[in-house]
Amino acid sequence: LTCLGGFASPGPVPPSTALRELIEELVNITQNQKAPLCNGSMVWSINLTAGMYCAALESLINVSGCSAIEKTQRMLSGFCPHKVSAGQFSSLHVRDTKIEVAQFVKDLLLHLKKLFREGQFN
């Protein structure tokens, strides 16, 4: 997480800055959405604990044709140490229920805000 360049600045981005920028992007998505986010697409919900960033990316990367979350997908890839492609699910990603992308983003945002307040940037 020491090299998250490309989101807002050309050089390495501190983890706290990267997390804040991800939170800001999710806030932007939730506030600016007039129609259902990604027009009703449903994704696998995730366990918001260990491996959360990769799990979130694994879930969202399956959604195509939704420009509203493309930046989020790119930002999450900076937090995940391995390359993630569509259809890939790690052992941490238990597929037990699907939710709308809008709800997924809201849940993720609430959790990331909590982590930020607690100073957990990694």
Partner: nanobody, 116 residues
Framework: EVQLLESGGGLVQPGGSLRLSCAAS????????MDWVRQAPGKGLEWVSS????????YYADSVKGRFTISRDNSKNTLYLQMNSLRAEDTAVYYC?????????WGQGTLVTVSS
């Protein structure tokens, strides 16, 4: 053009059974995970079940586990949902959907009403 056409809905008594079908066209059906999603009157969308492209792995919402069975026939480009032990709370419009896709890739839905 992607088309999904559901059928098999209707009125059934509590404890009864129905089998929903979804005929797919306009895409390579066997390449895609598929979903059943439902919407009860005045409620939001609720995911019901998913099946992987091969039909090997299936997933169910807790509310239907043990009562509903999802399956597919890739040779017929058709998705199925066998619904047993139906309850009043299963009353909804049932949609079949190409997984992870927008409403554009959903069917028009079939109404299932469970009532005595």
């Amino acid at each position: 053009e992607v088309q999904l056409l559901e059928s098999g809905g209707g009125l059934v008594q509590p404890g009864g059974s129905l089998r929903l079908s979804c005929a797919a066209s306009g895409f390579t059906f066997s390449d895609y995970e598929m979903d059943w999603v439902r919407q009860a009157p005045g409620k939001g969308l609720e995911w019901v079940s998913s099946i992987d492209n091969s039909g090997f792995s299936t997933y169910y919402a807790d509310s239907v586990k043990g009562r509903f069975t999802i399956s597919r026939d890739n040779s017929k480009n058709t998705l199925y949902l066998q619904m047993n032990s139906l309850r009043a709370e299963d009353t909804a419009v049932y949609y079949c959907a190409k997984a992870f896709s927008t409403f554009d890739y959903w069917g028009q839905g079939t109404l299932v009403t469970v009532s005595s």
